[in-house]
């Protein structure tokens, strides 16, 4: 039975230019993470193995670095990078929990944080 | 006692292939991630490329991508580099290792790939 | 890819002397680094992992600090048996990347 919940830094928005980082935590299991895949609408932004580290895909290598912790640092956002980002945690025996972020990329300055949220 | 047994290496054209094998014994080998790690003459270590446990994902090196395959055979308890394309800078020694805490605890004797007319 | 940078190429030393090699990563890899020793014809051995974990059966006078970038693996008081070259090894992320080597040569 899978008990665990992902807790995401939920909608968020950003202005062109800047950087976000997007955040998963996967609380209330005790089971082991093998591996976490971020990836955004089907492609995949990388991956980082509990047994090899890191792995940023090669076509986003330029403008997302691992970290902090789990989580994922986006660069020089463009307007295009606006859209859902999916945090999949690969457990041990739980199996998959995934969380959802959407991220907006804001012309202005007016881009603010929205709240954290949960995912059962 | 925990082993790693590498074979397959020789004398091969530039542009031809090889596979190089390394049989595992002593331990569990489908809970590790594995990697091939290879040295030239006289240099130092060059990371190739690494198979997570399950074989689900394979990584490699940019100098490789696209000629190496890794692959792994977990009934067998064997880990296996495909080698294409073969290059006189691909001529070294081949060694494959197991991953535990990030870092490569377990590793063969190594089997010399030798790229030469 | 994160390069690694380390120092000295080589050195020389006598049975007894205290030896430092460093590491640098040219970013921070937090504390995913390893140290191997390796000597002519053979293949690596694993001492050190994650900075400063001595590996099971490896002996106690080898020893290693660090996290961020800069790195440092420590022979209290070197034997004969530890005359090898020495590489650093960054597992933070792919592609892992070795320091390029030192060798630690007889006085």
């Known amino acids: 039975m899978m008990t665990g919940t992902i807790e995401t830094t939920g909608n968020i928005s950003a202005e062109k230019g800047g950087s976000i980082i997007l955040q998963c935590h996967l609380s209330s299991t005790t089971a082991q993470v093998t591996q976490v895949n971020w990836e955004q609408q089907d492609q995949l932004l990388a991956i980082c193995n509990a047994d090899l580290g890191w792995h940023i895909s090669p076509s986003f290598k330029d403008r997302v670095a691992p970290g902090p912790g789990l989580g994922l640092t986006l660069q020089s956002l463009t307007v295009n990078d606006t859209g859902e980002y999916f945090c999949i945690y690969h457990t041990y025996p739980d199996g998959t929990y995934t969380g959802r972020i959407f991220l907006e990329v804001l012309e202005s300055s007016v881009a603010e944080h929205g709240a954290r949220f949960q995912i059962p | 006692e925990v082993q790693l047994l590498e074979s397959g290496g020789g004398l091969v054209q530039p542009g031809g292939s090889l596979r190089l094998s390394c049989a595992a014994s002593g331990f569990r080998f489908g809970n590790y991630a594995m990697s091939w790690v290879r040295q030239a003459p006289g240099k130092g270590l060059e990371w190739v490329s690494a198979?997570?446990?399950?074989?689900?994902?394979?990584f490699y090196a940019d100098s490789v991508k696209g000629r190496f395959t890794i692959s792994r055979d977990n009934s067998k308890n064997t880990l296996y580099l495909q080698i294409n394309s073969l290059r006189a800078e691909d001529t070294a020694v081949y060694y494959c290792a197991r991953v535990r805490n990030r870092a490569s605890d377990i590793w063969g004797q190594g089997t010399l790939v030798t790229v030469s007319s | 890819d994160i390069q690694m940078t380390q120092s000295p190429s080589s050195l020389s030393a006598s049975v007894g002397d205290r030896v430092t090699i460093t590491c640098r990563a040219s970013q921070t890899i937090i504390t995913y680094l390893n140290w191997y020793q390796q000597k002519p014809g053979k293949a690596p051995k694993l001492l050190i992992y994650?900075?400063?974990n001595l590996r099971s059966g490896v002996p106690s006078r080898f020893s290693g600090s660090g996290s961020g970038t800069d790195f440092t693996l420590t022979i209290s008081s070197l034997q004969p048996e530890d005359f090898a070259t020495y590489y650093c090894q960054q597992s933070y992320s792919l592609p892992w990347t070795f320091g390029g080597g030192t060798k630690v040569e007889i006085k």
């Open positions: 198979i997570t446990g399950s074989g689900g994902n394979t």
């Open positions: 994650a900075a400063s």
